[in-house]
C-alpha cells in the first residue's frame, strides 16, 4: 500500500514539475511577445510623432509660402496699377522695400557718406529717413542691424533740420546722452553736421564723410 502511494506521489511530482517547466516556458514566451509588442508600439508611436511633426512643419512652410505668395501677388498687382498711373505717389512699396504705417523704407547694406546717401535716396524718389515717433524709431532699429546708420537729419546749414521739412524742435528726438555735441575739432570747416543711429538705435552727430549705412523713406499713397 505504502509503496503504491509513494509511486503515485512521485508521478504527481513529475507531472507537476513538467507542468511548472512548461508554464515557465509559456510565461517567458508571452513576456517576450509582450516586450516585442511594447517595442513595436513605441516604434509606431515615435513614427507617428515624427510624421505629425513633419506634417506640422510642412503645414507651417506651406502657410508661409501662401502668405508670401499673397503678399507678392498684392505687390505685383499694385505695381502693375502703379505703371498705369502717373507715378507721382507710390501706391505700394517697391520690391525689397518694407512698408510701415503708410511709408516705404529701404535699408542699405553697404556704407556711404551722408551726402552720397542723401543723393542715392533722391534718385530713388525718396529721402533719408525722418523719424516721427517712438514706434517708427523701434521699426527702424529692428531692421537696421548693429551698425551706424545715417538718417535725414543735418545741421549743415545752421540749425538741425529734417530733410523733408518736418519741424525738428517739436518733433521726436532720441539722442545719446550729451549729444548732439557738434564737435568742431575735426577741421572740416564745420561741426559734426550729420545725424546717425548708433548701434543701439540712439542718435549721434558725426562727420558727414563717414561711410555708414543709410535708410531711405518714401511716402505711400494713403488712399490705397
Amino acid at each position: 500500500q505504502n509503496s503504491k502511494l509513494r509511486g503515485e506521489l512521485q508521478a504527481l511530482r513529475e507531472t507537476f514539475s513538467n507542468f511548472t517547466a512548461s508554464t515557465e516556458v509559456e510565461v517567458k514566451a508571452l513576456s517576450s511577445q509582450g516586450g516585442n509588442v511594447g517595442r513595436k508600439m513605441k516604434s509606431l508611436e515615435s513614427q507617428l510623432e515624427k510624421q505629425q511633426k513633419d506634417l506640422s512643419e510642412d503645414h507651417s512652410d506651406l502657410l508661409l509660402h501662401v502668405k508670401q505668395f499673397v503678399s507678392d501677388l498684392r505687390s505685383l498687382s499694385c505695381q502693375i496699377a502703379a505703371l498705369h498711373g502717373n507715378g507721382s505717389t507710390l501706391t505700394c512699396c517697391p520690391v525689397n522695400w518694407l512698408e510701415y504705417e503708410g511709408s516705404c523704407y529701404w535699408f542699405s547694406r553697404s556704407g556711404k557718406s551722408w551726402p552720397e546717401a542723401d543723393k542715392y535716396c533722391q534718385l530713388e524718389s525718396a529721402h533719408l529717413v525722418v523719424v516721427n515717433s517712438r514706434e517708427e524709431q523701434k521699426f527702424i532699429q529692428h531692421h537696421m542691424g548693429p551698425v551706424n546708420t545715417w538718417m535725414g537729419l543735418t545741421d549743415q546749414s545752421g540749425p538741425w533740420k529734417w530733410v523733408d521739412g518736418t519741424d525738428y524742435e517739436t518733433g521726436f528726438k532720441n539722442w545719446r546722452p550729451e549729444q548732439p555735441d557738434d564737435w568742431y575739432g575735426h577741421g572740416l570747416g564745420g561741426g559734426e553736421d550729420c545725424a546717425h543711429f548708433t548701434d543701439d538705435g540712439r542718435w549721434n552727430d558725426d562727420v558727414c564723410q563717414r561711410p555708414y549705412r543709410w535708410v531711405c523713406e518714401a511716402a505711400r499713397d494713403p488712399a490705397t
Epitope: S110, G111, S113, G185, H186, L188, D206, V207, Q209, R210
Partner: antibody
Framework: QVQLVESGGGVVQPGRSLRLSCAAS????????MHWVRQAPGKGLEWVAV????????NYADSVKGRFTISRDNSKNTLYLQMNSLRAEDTAVYYC?????????????WGQGTTVTVSS | DIQMTQSPSSLSASVGDRVTITCRTS??????LAWFQQKPGKAPKSLLY???SLQSGVPSKFSGSGSGTDFTLTISSLQPEDFATYYC?????????FGGGTKVEIK
C-alpha cells in the same frame, strides 16, 4: 588670445592668380570687420581692402579694384583675398588685420603676414 | 583720396629722449587717426586710435594729440625697444590711407 594667421602666399607669374587665407581665433570673428594691408619690399604700408562683419560691404584700393576680391566665411572664421591678373607691383607682404568694429573703425590686431612674389 | 604726410621721414635720438612725430592730412579727418609701430621683419602693432586713445597693453609713454588735419605722436622717454618705424593712418573714409612712415634710429 586673439590671433590672425595668413597663408597662401608664394611665387607666381604675372597674369596668374593666387588666393590668400587668414584664419582667425580667440575672438568672435563674425562681429568684426576685416582688412587686407600690404607692404612692398622696403616700402611703407598700403591698405588693400575691407569687408564688413557680415560681408555686406566691401571696399578696395584703386590699385587693386577689379582684380582683387575680398570675402569671408564666418562659419570657418576665415578671411580670403582672391588675387587675379597679378602684376609685378603686387609683390609684397600681405597682412590681414582686424577692424576695431564692424568695418569702419580702424585696425587693431594684425597677422604675421604672408609673402607674395610676382615674377616671370 | 586723403593724402597723409609724415615728418620727419627719419630721426636719430638717444635713449631717454622725448620724441615727437607729426602727421598732416590733405583734408580734415576729425579724430579718425591711428598710429602704428613696426619693427624690421615684423607685423605692425597698433598704438593709438581716435588720435589720442591708447590701445590696451600699450605703455603710457606713448601719447597722441591733434584733430582735423594736424596730429602728433609723442614718446615721452625713448627706450631701446622703441627704435622702429612709425606710421599714421586715417580711417575717416575709404580708401584708408597711411603716412609714409618715420624711422626712429639710435643716435
Amino acid at each position: 588670445q586673439v590671433q590672425l594667421v595668413e597663408s597662401g602666399g608664394g611665387v607666381v607669374q604675372p597674369g596668374r592668380s593666387l588666393r590668400l587665407s587668414c584664419a582667425a581665433s580667440g575672438f568672435t570673428f563674425s562681429t568684426y570687420g576685416m582688412h587686407w594691408v600690404r607692404q612692398a619690399p622696403g616700402k611703407g604700408l598700403e591698405w588693400v581692402a575691407v569687408i564688413w562683419y557680415d560681408g555686406s560691404n566691401k571696399n578696395y584700393a584703386d590699385s587693386v579694384k577689379g582684380r582683387f576680391t575680398i570675402s569671408r566665411d564666418n562659419s570657418k572664421n576665415t578671411l580670403y583675398l582672391q588675387m587675379n591678373s597679378l602684376r609685378a607691383e603686387d609683390t609684397a607682404v600681405y597682412y590681414c588685420a582686424r577692424d576695431q568694429g564692424v568695418g569702419y573703425d580702424g585696425l587693431d590686431v594684425w597677422g604675421q603676414g604672408t609673402t607674395v612674389t610676382v615674377s616671370s | 583720396d586723403i593724402q597723409m604726410t609724415q615728418s620727419p621721414s627719419s630721426l636719430s635720438a638717444s635713449v631717454g629722449d622725448r620724441v615727437t612725430i607729426t602727421c598732416r592730412t590733405s583734408q580734415g579727418i576729425g579724430n579718425y587717426l591711428a598710429w602704428f609701430q613696426q619693427k624690421p621683419g615684423k607685423a605692425p602693432k597698433s598704438l593709438l586710435y581716435k588720435a589720442s586713445s591708447l590701445q590696451s597693453g600699450v605703455p603710457s609713454k606713448f601719447s597722441g594729440s591733434g584733430s582735423g588735419t594736424d596730429f602728433t605722436l609723442t614718446i615721452s622717454s625713448l627706450q631701446p625697444e622703441d627704435f622702429a618705424t612709425y606710421y599714421c593712418q586715417q580711417y575717416m573714409t575709404y580708401p584708408l590711407t597711411f603716412g609714409g612712415g618715420t624711422k626712429v634710429e639710435i643716435k
